[in-house]
């Protein structure tokens, strides 16, 4: 049987980006099940190291189980993780029944912001927004929200927040106790 081309064999290869906060550089982990041969870049344990944020890198992938042409993988390196901060934007006067969470860009970067998507999951609710506002919540309840940021559909950072809503007003408290 003839061998596939490496371009075909690795057509659907996916990548995870891992950030080093000390060096401020990324590692791209190639999600493959076998040892692969990398060109134009050196790979260690199927990882390409020392990638600069917002700078494209190209790596050609081959193996002797496949023929030319090699798979050319363009690594779209995301912005640095510390450029983003998950901020609690809940208004104090509404903190008993609402939660507001917002991703803030706290430093500039050169990546195309159009390629950045934000995702929140609070309980079984999913939101694809940079900011979420949950309303009509129970006072004095804990709510957990998980969030992630994706660059060109690759997750590169995530955060979780557990927020406890404030005590309700005395009137609300009376009503809730009567309901019990």
């Amino acid at each position: 049987p003839s061998k596939p081309t490496c371009d075909e064999k690795y057509a659907n290869i996916t990548v995870d980006y891992l950030y080093n906060k000390e060096t401020k550089l990324f590692t791209a982990k190639l999600n493959v099940n076998e040892n692969v041969e990398c060109g134009n870049n050196t790979c260690t344990n199927n990882e390409v190291h020392n990638l600069t944020e917002c700078k494209n890198a190209s790596v050609s992938i081959s193996h002797n189980s496949c023929t030319a042409p090699d798979k050319t993988l363009i690594l779209d390196v995301p912005p640095g993780v510390e450029k983003f901060q998950l901020h609690d934007c809940t208004q104090v006067e509404k903190a008993d029944t609402t939660i507001c969470l917002k991703w803030k860009n706290i430093e500039t970067f050169t990546c195309d912001t159009q390629n950045i998507t934000y995702r929140f999951q609070c309980g079984n609710m999913i939101f694809d927004n940079k900011e979420i506002k949950l309303e009509n919540l129970e006072p004095e309840h804990e709510y957990k929200c998980d969030s992630e940021i994706l660059y060109n559909n690759h997750k590169f950072t995530n955060a979780s927040k557990i927020i406890k809503t404030d005590f309700g007003s005395p009137e609300q408290k009376l009503i809730s106790e009567e309901d019990l």
Partner: nanobody
Framework: QVQLQESGGGLVQPGGSLRLSCAAS????????MGWFRQAPGKEREFVSS????????YYAGAVRGRFTISRDNAKNTVYLQMNSLQPEDTAVYYC????????????????WGQGTLVTVSS
């Protein structure tokens, strides 16, 4: 038929360094992924490091990553293992091996093996 011959083993103190070499003959060296394995007394043979045909891709076992460096010189038909910060637990017979398929780092993936060179780390 590929023949492999390791050299460079010996006795070294903890924290010391050694460089192992593996010379290949009898085949086209650049057709093979190369690996280093080790076997300590009473233990199974374990993967240490491997390197692709061109040398652009390398793999390390967790226990040696950051301390050992694999390299190859296709013009000299030789693969090297530079071992730094050696510890008593690195004591073993080190084997060089060649694989034409080089799909993973399992010893069964490698068709050709050297005789081994003994590395002893002791004060």
């Amino acid at each position: 038929q590929v023949q492999l011959q390791e050299s460079g083993g010996g006795l070294v103190q903890p924290g010391g360094s050694l460089r192992l070499s593996c010379a290949a003959s009898g085949g086209t060296f650049s057709d093979y992924g190369m690996g280093w394995f080790r076997q300590a007394p009473g233990k199974e043979r374990e993967f240490v490091s491997s390197i692709s045909w061109s040398g652009n891709s390398v793999y390390y076992a967790g226990a040696v990553r950051g301390r050992f460096t694999i390299s190859r010189d296709n013009a000299k038909n030789t693969v090297y293992l530079q071992m730094n910060s050696l510890q008593p637990e690195d004591t073993a017979v080190y084997y060089c091996a060649a694989s034409s398929t080089w799909n993973n780092n399992d010893p069964t993936e490698y068709e050709y093996w050297g005789q081994g060179t003994l590395v002893t780390v002791s004060s």
